[in-house]
């Protein structure tokens, strides 16, 4: 019988050089062999390119579109194929439904004295259009104690944040992640970075915990 | 190494049919759309058209009656075809590859002047 | 068809000087716009595509800007192999270029 489509596709870009269409079949498909999804630009004369899908579930499938650099223009049209048959037309402007890369290189630095210091990469290079408008989450918790989960809102532009080694507890391990948004093109959140786990040995100068002690 | 280069007469007669071969390496036809582009002595660029990679073509309005492209991906070839030369059309021809999604030319031929006279 | 016009048409400078050409188009064509560098004899190479986005393996002295009718090449310190000429190009079908700007040296 004729195959149907479930749930439209949905995608979401980069805003770099890919695209990724997640959407589902109507019944199992093994989407790399039967469908292909075609896309052009708009308005320029250019290529028709073909993404072969991959499964992404027993009824899922997802592509991921090449692109170059994204523009705020940019339209493009989607066709859904199974063989000769079309199951589904439509487009995609990737400016106006953005993911960001998620930030990478998260590293913490334990050896400033009273501070511990996350840095980590922003995940554009600088002519991108997102590079100077990505702001970012940090959140830290911890697998020694499970009541301590923070979410750090990072609203400055500098990939870093500074957290008084005082605030966490000594002698326990922390991790840390990092994701991206960018406001001004009304994104969704990145993915989490890979998670990073540091040993907090910070311990209060003995002054201070003899004044807690007695206090 | 991307390379491209345009190989074919360098001398035409007015109403005569100009054929000009694009040879490729580096890169696969099925992968890449292929541009011809000319320039006249002194003057500026001018795109002709276009084949694509799945081998559909886009043609420049001002030539579309008299211009063909085609492909054979086996031999690595582009070929343009050119009918009715005109002293007008004395002109180094360039083929240039499509870059990604986007019609400009990330890699050119170095070009073959053709010039077109009785 | 959308006309391509770039300005000046020649410009005399000296190595190490800031240069800014300028190409504006008869009709919005967003950020759909490339520059190349011809040399006498040679084939264009693309210096910038999107307006702005810097091709794979150019100097980063070379920049692009604007969008819509207005776009500029800006050569931020002038080196003896950037003379030459520069054509800009759109590409809202069918694709066009300018009629191009000499960079000679002063």
């Known amino acids: 019988g004729s195959m149907k489509v479930l749930q439209e596709p949905a995608c979401v870009s980069d805003y770099m050089s890919i695209s990724t269409c997640e959407w589902k079949m109507g019944g199992p498909t093994n989407c790399s062999a039967e469908l292909r999804l075609l896309y052009q630009l708009v308005f320029q004369s250019s290529e028709t390119h073909t993404c072969v899908p991959e499964n992404n579930g027993g009824v899922g499938c997802v592509c991921h579109l090449l692109m170059d650099d994204v523009v705020s223009m940019d339209n493009y049209t989607l066709d859904l194929w199974a063989g000769q048959q079309l199951l589904w037309k439509g487009s995609f402007k990737p400016s106006e439904h953005v993911k960001p890369r998620a930030p990478g290189n998260l590293t913490v630095h334990t050896n400033v004295s009273d501070t511990v210091l996350l840095t980590w990469s922003n995940p554009y290079p600088p002519d991108n259009y997102l590079y100077n408008d990505l702001t970012y989450a940090v959140n830290i918790w911890s697998e020694n104690d499970p009541a301590y989960s923070r979410i750090h809102n990072v609203t400055y532009l500098k990939p870093t944040l500074r957290i008084p080694a005082s605030t966490l507890k000594s002698g326990i391990s922390y991790r840390a992640r990092v994701r991206a948004w960018a406001q001004h093109y009304n994104t969704t959140w990145s993915e989490w970075s890979p998670s990073t786990k540091w040993y907090n040995s910070y311990r209060e100068p003995f002054e201070q915990r003899h004044h807690h002690h007695h206090h | 190494e991307v390379t491209l280069k345009e190989s074919g007469p360098v001398l035409v007669k007015p109403t005569e049919t100009l054929t000009l071969t694009c040879t490729v390496s580096?890169?696969?036809?099925?992968?890449?759309?292929v541009h011809w582009i000319r320039q006249p002595p002194g003057k500026a660029l001018e795109w002709l058209g276009v084949i694509w990679s799945g081998g559909s073509t886009d043609y420049n309005a001002a030539f579309k009656s008299r211009l063909t492209i085609s492909k054979d991906n086996s031999k690595s070839q582009v070929v343009l075809t050119m009918t009715n030369m005109d002293p007008v059309d004395t002109a180094t021809y360039y083929c240039?590859?499509?870059?990604?999604?986007?019609?400009?030319?990330?890699?050119w031929g170095q070009g073959t002047t053709v010039t077109v006279s009785s | 068809d959308i006309q391509m016009t770039q300005s000046p048409s020649s410009l005399s400078a000296s190595v190490g000087d800031r240069v800014t050409i300028t190409c504006r188009a008869s009709e919005n064509i967003y950020s759909y716009l490339a520059w190349y560098q011809q040399k006498p004899g040679k084939a264009p190479k693309l210096l910038i595509y999107n307006a702005k986005t810097l091709a794979e393996g150019v100097p980063s002295r070379f920049s692009g800007s604007g969008s819509g009718t207005d776009f500029t090449l800006t050569i931020s310190s002038l080196q003896p192999e950037d003379f030459a000429t520069y054509y800009c190009?759109?590409?809202?079908?069918?694709?066009?270029f300018g009629q191009g700007t000499k960079l000679e040296i002063k």
């Open positions: 580096g890169f696969s036809l099925t992968n890449y759309g």
């Open positions: 240039a590859r499509n870059k990604g999604t986007r019609p400009v030319f990330d890699y």
């Open positions: 190009q759109h590409y809202v079908s069918p694709l066009t």
